[in-house]
Interface confidence: low
């Protein structure tokens, strides 16, 4: 049986503190009591705490802990969220400029191709944007589609302007001939390599940033259990029950409690370290053909070179295509 | 040679930006992000200590609370007594990660594998099979502006890359981030309960 409190002992200090937590004083004893019903702040002697106060302390301790955790991750979370948004927007701007550069190249060098070329270029860069954002599109198909669409227009407008615009049958034949005859040389393959490598890296970079946000969000919103709440209460609030209002927890004791409460979170550490180092490795490799900014902004030049290649070989190509697609042409002329 | 599309319906503001020498490139912004992220490399292992340092803990006081009683800060009791019958640290360490942590760890493992797969060895400009097919890297040395495309008339140098970040309406100095002081900011009297 604990000794009775001295006659002049009151719970006045404890009451004034607890009132800030819970307005209304009915839960705080007037004078220290045995506290035999307490489950967390087990008394060694008379106590100024009641069971209800303990419950309030536990809830408050858990809320404090959740807020400390969120406060701890705030700067990191802000860093990744803001950068993910910046890079996503920057990549979209790159794509927009690359499209504008390519359209401008057509308008300056090949005005007769512009209406259709703009359409094909627009579709290509829309696919590029979708791919970066995670869409299930094949980059080689995108590039092939661009050149498949461009060649009939180049053939009918630049190489053989006499053909009627509505030569749909010959268009299909020309699309097939484009690949069979390697009309654009190795330029489509070059573009495929550069675009696919640079976009893959860009896409994984954005995915990695978004996963970073998910990791922080997961650990940021963990709810602490009743047992953890009891530990925290014992550490932060049980001293008040003894009227020790100004005393603070011992540092080593705090570390042990926190390691217990956060054992799960700390498991992530090894993989988080690896994540940052792997991301660094990726970023270090994002140059030249692994840098979408570099690749996409120079695409107009490579496409221009590919059209020049067609023009240089126009004579030979026209003859070959004349034979290949003769049937289609005859039907058109009738 | 391709007519450099500078004076045609391209956003004039952007082209001006493209020739400012002192703005950051996307690649420098990426490197800057990595440097900042690296300062958080020990974030998870340091969390317990961080939280203790940002909640009331006896630092300069002679006496401190160990969960049961007031003790001297450097005594054996400071870390031990209050912990009796409360939990078994050894048991904690023996337990594997729980499913919800495992789930996020699995996602991290997966992305780490992808990142490593995608990380390219330095110094390669083009794939070997492309080099063999006659697309050489031309005169573009490591310290020059980047080159794109084949050699010949079509070669064009993209000068120093676009300086997008002048155009982006973000200011990413983390010093301006909300709550950068990393102190818990009580939302209401329910939570503002540390008595210092």
């Amino acid at each position: 049986q604990p000794p009775p409190p001295p006659p002049d002992a009151t719970c006045h200090q404890v009451r004034s503190f607890f009132q800030r937590l819970q307005p209304g004083l009915k839960w705080v004893p007037e004078t220290p009591v045995p506290g035999s019903d307490l489950q967390v702040c087990l008394p060694k002697g008379p106590t100024c705490c009641s069971r209800k106060m303990e419950e309030k302390y536990q809830l408050t301790a858990r809320l404090n802990m959740e807020q400390l955790l969120q406060s701890a991750s705030m700067e990191l979370k802000f860093l990744i969220i803001q950068n993910a948004a910046v890079f996503q927007e920057a990549f979209e701007i790159v794509v927009r400029h690359a499209k504008n550069y390519t359209n401008a190249m057509f308008k300056n060098n090949y005005p007769s191709l512009t209406p259709q070329a703009f359409e094909f270029v627009g579709e290509f860069f829309t696919d590029v944007s979708l791919y970066i954002l995670g869409s299930d599109i094949n980059v080689d198909d995108m590039v092939n589609e661009l050149f498949d669409s461009l060649f009939p227009v180049i053939y009918t407008q630049l190489m053989n302007p006499g053909l009627p615009d509505s030569a749909l049958d010959i268009n299909e034949c020309l699309r097939g001939a484009r690949r069979d005859l390697k009309v654009f040389g190795n330029f489509p393959k070059l573009i495929m390599t550069q675009v696919s490598k640079s976009l893959q890296v860009t896409r994984i970079f954005l995915q990695a940033l978004n996963l970073g946000i998910e990791v922080i969000n997961t650990t940021d919103h963990l709810k602490f259990s009743k047992d953890c709440g009891r530990m925290l209460t014992r550490m932060w609030y049980c001293s008040y029950c003894q009227g020790l209002m100004m005393v603070k927890p011992c540092g080593g004791y705090c570390n042990v409690v926190m390691q217990g409460c956060m054992a799960g979170v700390v498991e992530i550490d090894k993989y988080w370290r690896e994540y940052i180092l792997s991301l660094e490795e990726l970023v270090n490799g994002m140059y030249r053909i692994y840098d979408m900014e570099n690749v996409l902004l120079g695409l107009f030049s490579t496409i221009h070179d590919s059209i020049q290649y067609v023009q240089k070989n126009a004579g030979k190509l026209t003859t070959t295509i004349g034979k290949l697609c003769a049937h289609s042409q005859q039907r058109q002329y009738r | 040679s391709a007519y450099y599309p500078e004076d045609l319906f391209i956003d004039k503001k952007v082209l001006k930006v493209a020739h400012v020498e002192h703005e950051e490139t996307l690649s420098s912004r990426r490197r800057e992000l990595i440097q900042k992220l690296k300062s958080f490399i020990s974030f998870y292992s340091a969390l317990p200590g961080y939280i203790c340092s940002h909640s009331p803990v006896a630092e300069n006081d002679t006496l401190c609370w160990n969960g049961q009683e007031l003790v001297e800060r450097y005594s054996q009791k400071a870390a031990r007594n209050g912990m009796k019958n409360q939990f078994n640290l050894h048991e904690l360490k023996m337990k594997g990660p729980e499913p919800v942590v495992s789930q996020i760890i699995d996602k991290l493992k997966h992305i780490n594998q992808l990142l490593r797969t995608m990380s390219m060895p330095k110094g390669r400009v083009l794939d070997k099979n492309l080099d063999e097919e006659g697309f050489e890297s031309g005169d573009c040395g490591d310290d020059e502006d980047e080159c794109i495309g084949g050699s010949g008339d079509g070669m064009i140098k993209v000068k120093n890359q676009l300086r997008f970040l002048a155009e982006l309406a973000y200011d990413l100095d983390v010093d301006d981030a909300p709550g950068n002081s990393q102190q818990a900011t009580p939302k209401d009297n329910e939570i503002s309960t540390f008595h210092n």
Partner: antibody, heavy 126, light 106 residues
Framework: EVQLVESGGGLVQPGGSLRLSCAAS????????MSWVRQAPGKGLEWVSN????????YYADSVKGRFTISRDNSKNTLYLQMNSLRAEDTAVYYC???????????????????WGQGTTVTVSS | QSVLTQPPSVSGAPGQRVTISCTGS?????VHWYQQLPGRAPKLLIY???NRPSGVPDRFSGSNSGTSASLAITGLQAEDEADYYC??????????FGGGTKLTVL
């Protein structure tokens, strides 16, 4: 296959007692908290009680506190609900459910109840 | 005791999209959703606000904002006719359920 099978329901007079059992199989029983949830005829679900994996933590809804006792025998993979001082308003289908909660140290992640039994009917009537 | 409030009933034609709201979750814990087919035990449908256990079609999705949550069902099918309950935890981590919503497929 993860399964929960309740038993022990029946007709009982007001003031009487019943003991419900729930046999678990297909998962590590002691690793999960377990709950009892009831559903009065034509009404919604009401949480009654739950118990931690080890059995040392028990929690009750205000409506049953002091009358019902939850317990578990991990060696038999069985959950129990001892119901005393039964009232007409305790008439319901009683389900046992596995808590989808993950624990690490003292950190819990609460994700609802992912496995339910088929239910056992308790009728309190004179 | 905390209370979660749901509309008593909602209805929609096959192929339509319906949403069921759940308000009053002030403890900050996630909201989970259950489906109870007539005469059957409840089944976990969405956990942690928007995660589907395996076997639950992606037509079902959840969302959370502040003290309210909602369950959305797209491409409504006849077999979706059931009672739907939201569930969370109060500040003492005791489970609390919403009153339930009867979904009728017209």
């Amino acid at each position: 296959e993860v399964q929960l099978v309740e038993s022990g329901g029946g007709l009982v007079q007001p003031g009487g007692s019943l003991r419900l059992s729930c046999a678990a199989s297909g998962f590590t029983f002691e690793g999960y908290a377990m709950s009892w949830v009831r559903q009065a005829p034509g009404k919604g679900l009401e949480w009654v009680s739950n118990v931690s994996g080890s059995g040392d933590g028990t929690y009750y809804a205000d409506s049953v506190k002091g009358r019902f006792t939850i317990s578990r025998d991990n060696s038999k993979n069985t959950l129990y609900l001892q119901m005393n001082s039964l009232r007409a308003e305790d008439t319901a289908v009683y389900y046992c459910a596995k808590e989808y909660d993950y624990k690490t140290g003292w950190m819990h992640y609460y994700y609802g109840m992912d496995v339910w039994g088929q239910g056992t009917t308790v009728t309190v009537s004179s | 005791q905390s209370v979660l409030t749901q509309p008593p009933s909602v209805s929609g034609a096959p192929g339509q999209r319906v949403t069921i709201s759940c308000t009053g979750s002030s403890s900050g814990y996630d909201v989970h959703w259950y489906q109870q087919l007539p005469g059957r035990a409840p089944k976990l449908l969405i956990y942690g606000s928007n995660n589907r256990p395996s076997g639950v079609p992606d037509r079902f999705s959840g969302s959370n904002s502040g003290t309210s949550a909602s369950l959305a069902i797209t491409g409504l099918q006849a077999e979706d006719e059931a009672d739907y309950y939201c569930q969370s935890y109060d500040s003492s981590l005791n489970a609390i359920f919403g009153g339930g919503t009867k979904l009728t497929v017209l």
